[in-house]
Interface confidence: low
């Protein structure tokens, strides 16, 4: 059988512990908040909350100012300080639950754990190309704020989403709280609500609009805020909360809950269940329900496409798509299939599905048995009746009220289960150039950043590094400042280049040089770099061939042999076809004509393995010596390919000359009827890559070959005589005379 | 092609021990979960042991709980069973099965099969 | 233990013949009921998983049917290569499985 070039794994080509190490920031505590400003004018900032501190840092990660924010009654609390004398609540830290950027103001805002969830306002001040904070201002007027009835309690000690809208002058806050019946009972904040803030910032109007978890059910049916943004005209909070209000609460799944971003109202608050399943392709799945789901989200983050992945996804290039990770449960269980995946959800047709789903609810005809849903809001009812109505009145609409879609938007993991054992706590995706990247955070403090691919069955890596060495998760919310996205891990804040740390993990010249233009690689002689890493020799231009392997090791110094090449960058063509003079193979002081390629043996070969092949015919000149030589590949003259063109030499060492000696032969006679077992003994028999034992011209069929003896079994004779023996080794003869004599059968 | 190889079987006195290997090929062996089902001469199936795919959770048949030890190997695409104290009931072909995917409903529905290994078990 | 009981425990059939495998649990089990084909000196072979469903490349002469305590494996037109032992398994109690005793298909 011909052998075969042994396969390198795609990963040969990549070291991802090469040690990167980018500008960071140690906080003092665990990062608990962090958001960027980008101003018009050059400034730009940082902000890092952590327990009872807030850090306003510069581009560079530097520190430019220090706020203190708790604990609440201590006389050091700079932001307690603004809300008038005390005391104002029970004394405690403050942990931040809520960073976010008025943009409007522009203004910081942060809301603690601490005195009743309230919020402070930070005016930004800019100063040079850095930002300072201005005194705060108290977000809570302590005349319109009762236990039942508190405009001004934002903050949920167990975790609260915002997301601020501007609508003409005003700035709405969207506000997504996780509660249970303690929080609910002490200054209620709401599970969902909209609060305009007031113009002289004295706090948040009352009156505002509402949604809340019934009490009845706030011991067991609670809800996580994971995420919330605002794209087109809508905002969107995405949730993990118990899949039924009846059922077991430990059977979770993901919601999307749409609210409109042009009318602070609640009428058309809209959710819809995300399904995100992992399909394994190791077999082809009998099963029904369309591959192991994957309920729980653990980040998203929402962003428009590039070409590639909007192609893939029948969406055009630009959209806006909602990527989410997601894991099998809490608690990770003894799970199969990967720990994360991640699955896309294209944002128009959330809202399409959202639609068909009001359509569905309100339009005749009446679909029987058809919920409205989220009874843990609001009053049970079907459709198309309003909650805890029997019947639709004549002034009221179906549309005014809210409603859970009755069918579940379900998508695929877009990595295909590569992503293994990985578990992603961390995610931000970019489009560069017509590329969409995945930045993703892992929880033993790793980044990984990922082309967002469909159709490969391996991960196109742009990097894959340690943030630092203490392993800590990385944190789930990411920001993005200018050309960096800035992660948290325990208690340092690291800026990441969104083109990658550097180029220094890929190993050869042909990964370097397929690298994605926006990373800006090239080849420095031995390594792969950026240009200010190795300004003398580095070139994005060409690749020398690399040989790593050949076959066979040895040969006749008579004959020729086929000799095949293994290694990388011999074509740049898949179908692997050799311009005329382009490839010089010379063994020891002997050429190697090049072979055309056998298209039936073409074989695909999938490209997280790769290895390239190149036979030639040896036949050693008249001067060649036996013994040990090298095995030299010049390739010369060939067309650039698509990334770079080859140029250069690869010698390997290890092939050996020797001459084959036949020295018996037995038994020297047999029946005419042929079949007898000839053993040739001798030495180097098994060199190279043919032999053929000829009885009177016919070949004995082999049965066995090595070094010092070959087995074969005589053809029929045409009569009873002696005949010519001989054993040719590369179609040249072995020297010796040899005779076989065919007898009476 | 997707594929399970048992070895380790033989002939072993009563109250010895033996060690098989089941060696899996063609699909991504750390994501499934393993078990080992048996067959004495002439009989049905009888389920012996099963393993979670990070070998954290590992379940046996009563006949031969405290007996036998199932572990694996995903680095080395490997599942194993340790049987100790064997006596002359354990005669069995010994298969290794992987499921057909990660639904409750058909976790343990086995469409892979190995060949088997005869363990005989006599004085 | 949920116990599985199998009947016939072997039966003779002639090919082109409609033969029921039927297969009872001790106690409900959903449709968490397998079937299997096994051949001498061969591995048992996947028929039907979760009662009903046909498992890839079998062909669709092959069916079941059932829910809770009682299920059925019927081959609608028995061919030469069908004649085997089937085994009903349970994985309702998994990991702690149990299979049937066995069906034999003889050729009359």
């Known amino acids: 059988e011909d052998w075969q070039c042994p396969r390198t794994p795609y990963a040969a080509s990549r070291d991802f512990d090469v040690k990167y190490v980018v500008p960071s920031f140690s906080a003092g505590g665990l990062v608990q908040a962090m958001v960027t400003y980008e101003g018009d004018r050059n400034e730009s900032a940082v902000f890092v909350a952590i327990r009872n501190r807030l850090h306003v840092l510069g581009p560079d990660l530097k520190s430019v100012q220090s706020l203190a924010t708790g604990p609440a009654g201590d006389p050091g609390c700079q932001t307690c300080a603004a809300c008038g004398p005390g005391p104002h609540g029970p004394p405690g830290d403050t942990d931040t639950k809520v960073l976010v950027l008025d943009p409007a103001l522009p203004a910081l805002v942060s809301c603690g754990s601490s005195l009743q969830g309230r919020c402070f306002l930070h005016d930004l001040e800019p100063q040079g190309t850095a930002v300072h904070l201005a005194a705060p201002a108290c977000l809570f007027s302590a005349h319109h704020n009762r236990p039942d009835d508190c405009p001004d309690c934002v903050a949920s000690p167990l975790g609260t989403r915002v997301t601020v809208v501007e609508q003409g002058q005003a700035s709405y806050f969207y506000v997504a709280s996780s509660l249970d019946a303690a929080v609910a009972a002490s200054f209620s904040p709401r599970s969902v609500s909209i609060r305009r803030l007031k113009a002289d910032a004295s706090g948040f109007a009352p009156g505002f609009v509402a949604l809340s978890v019934l009490p009845k059910h706030l011991v067991s049916y609670s809800i996580e805020y994971v995420h919330s943004f605002h794209t087109g005209a809508f905002v969107y909070f995405l949730t993990v909360q118990p899949a039924s209000v009846t059922d077991d609460p430990s059977a979770l799944h993901t919601r999307l809950a749409r609210l409109s971003a042009t009318e602070p109202e609640l009428g058309d608050y809209r959710e819809l269940v995300l399904d995100c399943r992992f399909a394994p392709k190791r077999r082809r799945r009998g099963a029904p329900e369309g591959g192991q789901p994957y309920p729980v989200l653990r980040v998203a983050h929402s962003a428009p496409v590039g070409a590639q992945l909007a192609t893939e996804l029948s969406i055009a290039e630009g959209q806006e798509v909602l990527f989410g990770v997601f894991v099998t449960g809490k608690d990770g269980g003894p799970g199969v299939g990967p720990n994360s995946v991640v699955c896309a959800f294209p944002i128009d047709l959330l809202d399409t599905l959202i639609d068909e789903g009001v359509e569905r609810c309100c339009e005749s005809p009446v679909h029987p048995g058809l919920r409205r849903g989220l009874d843990f809001f609001q009053s049970p009812s079907f459709c198309p009746n309003p909650p805890g109505l029997e019947a639709l009145s004549p002034n009221t609409s179906c549309r005014h009220f809210p409603l859970l879609v009755s069918s579940s938007f379900s998508r695929v993991d877009l990595f295909n289960g590569l992503l293994g054992p990985v578990q992603v706590t961390a995610l931000y995706v970019t489009r560069l150039d017509n590329v969409t990247v995945a930045h993703m955070g892992t929880m033993d403090g790793r980044i990984l950043q990922v082309e967002l691919v469909r159709s490969l069955n391996y991960l196109l890596y742009v990097s894959n590094f340690s943030l630092g060495d203490s392993g800590q998760p990385v944190q789930r919310d990411v920001s993005r400042l200018g050309d960096h996205l800035l992660f948290a891990s325990g208690d340092q804040v690291f800026q990441v280049p969104i083109q990658g740390p550097g180029c220094r993990h890929f190993l050869t010249c042909g990964r370097c040089l397929r690298a994605w233009h926006f990373m800006g690689c090239g080849w420095c002689g031995n390594m792969c770099g950026q240009q200010k890493e190795c300004p003398g020799s580095w070139q994005q231009d060409h690749c020398p061939p690399k040989l790593t392997e050949f076959h066979p090791h040895s040969g006749p110094l008579r004959g020729s042999t086929r000799l095949t090449l293994c290694g990388s960058n011999f074509y740049l063509h898949p179908s692997g076809l050799v311009p005329e003079g382009t490839h010089q193979v010379t063994v020891g002081q002997s050429p190697c004509r090049p072979l055309p390629k056998d298209s039936s043996k073409l074989r695909p070969v999938p490209r997280k393995d790769f290895v390239e092949e190149f036979e030639c015919e040896l036949e050693p000149l008249g001067t060649q010596a036996v013994g040990p030589t090298n095995v030299s590949l010049t390739v010369t003259n060939m067309p650039p390919g698509k990334h770079f063109r080859v140029d250069g030499t690869s010698v390997l060492r290890g092939f050996s000359f020797m001459e084959p000696v036949l020295i018996a032969v037995q038994p020297l006679f047999g029946p005419r009827a042929g079949g007898t077992c000839l053993t040739l003994e001798g030495q180097s028999l098994s060199v190279g890559t043919s032999r053929a034992v000829l009885v009177n011209g016919t070949e004995c069929l082999l049965a066995r070959v090595s070094e010092g003896q070959l087995l074969c079994a005589t053809p029929p004779g045409a009569t009873v005589a002696s005949v010519p023996l001989s054993l040719q080794v590369g179609g040249a003869q072995v020297p010796g005379s040899w005779t076989f004599q065919y007898r009476e059968d | 092609e997707v594929q399970l190889l048992e070895s380790g079987g033989g002939l072993v006195q009563p109250g010895g021990s033996l060690r098989l290997s089941c060696a899996a090929s063609?699909?991504?062996?750390?994501?499934?979960?393993m078990t080992w089902v048996r067959q004495a001469p002439g009989k049905g199936l009888e389920w012996v042991s099963y393993?979670?795919?990070?070998?954290?959770?590992?379940h046996y048949a009563d006949s031969v709980k405290g007996r036998f030890t199932i572990s694996r190997d995903n680095s080395k695409n490997t599942l194993y069973l340790q049987m100790n104290s064997l006596r002359a009931e354990d005669t069995a072909v010994y298969y290794c099965?992987?499921?057909?995917?990660?639904?409750?409903?058909?976790?343990?529905?086995?469409?892979?099969w190995g060949q088997g290994t005869m363990v005989t078990v006599s004085s | 233990d949920i116990q599985m009981t199998q009947s016939p425990s072997s039966l003779s059939a002639s090919v082109g013949d409609r033969v029921a495998i039927t297969c009872r649990a001790s106690?409900?089990?959903?449709?968490?009921l397998n079937w299997y084909q096994q051949k001498p000196g061969k591995a048992p072979k996947l028929l039907i998983y979760a009662a009903s469903k046909l498992e890839d490349g079998v062909p669709s002469r092959f069916s079941g049917s059932g829910t809770g305590t009682d299920f059925t494996l019927t081959i609608r037109s028995l061919q030469p290569e069908d004649f085997a032992s089937y085994f009903c398994q349970q994985s309702y109690s998994s990991p702690g499985i149990t299979f049937g005793p066995g069906t034999k298909v003889e050729i009359k």
């Open positions: 099965a992987s499921p057909l995917g990660f639904y409750e409903r058909v976790a343990y529905a086995f469409d892979i």
């Open positions: 063609g699909f991504t062996f750390s994501w499934y979960r």
């Open positions: 106690q409900s089990i959903d449709t968490y």
């Open positions: 393993i979670s795919s990070s070998g954290g959770w590992t």
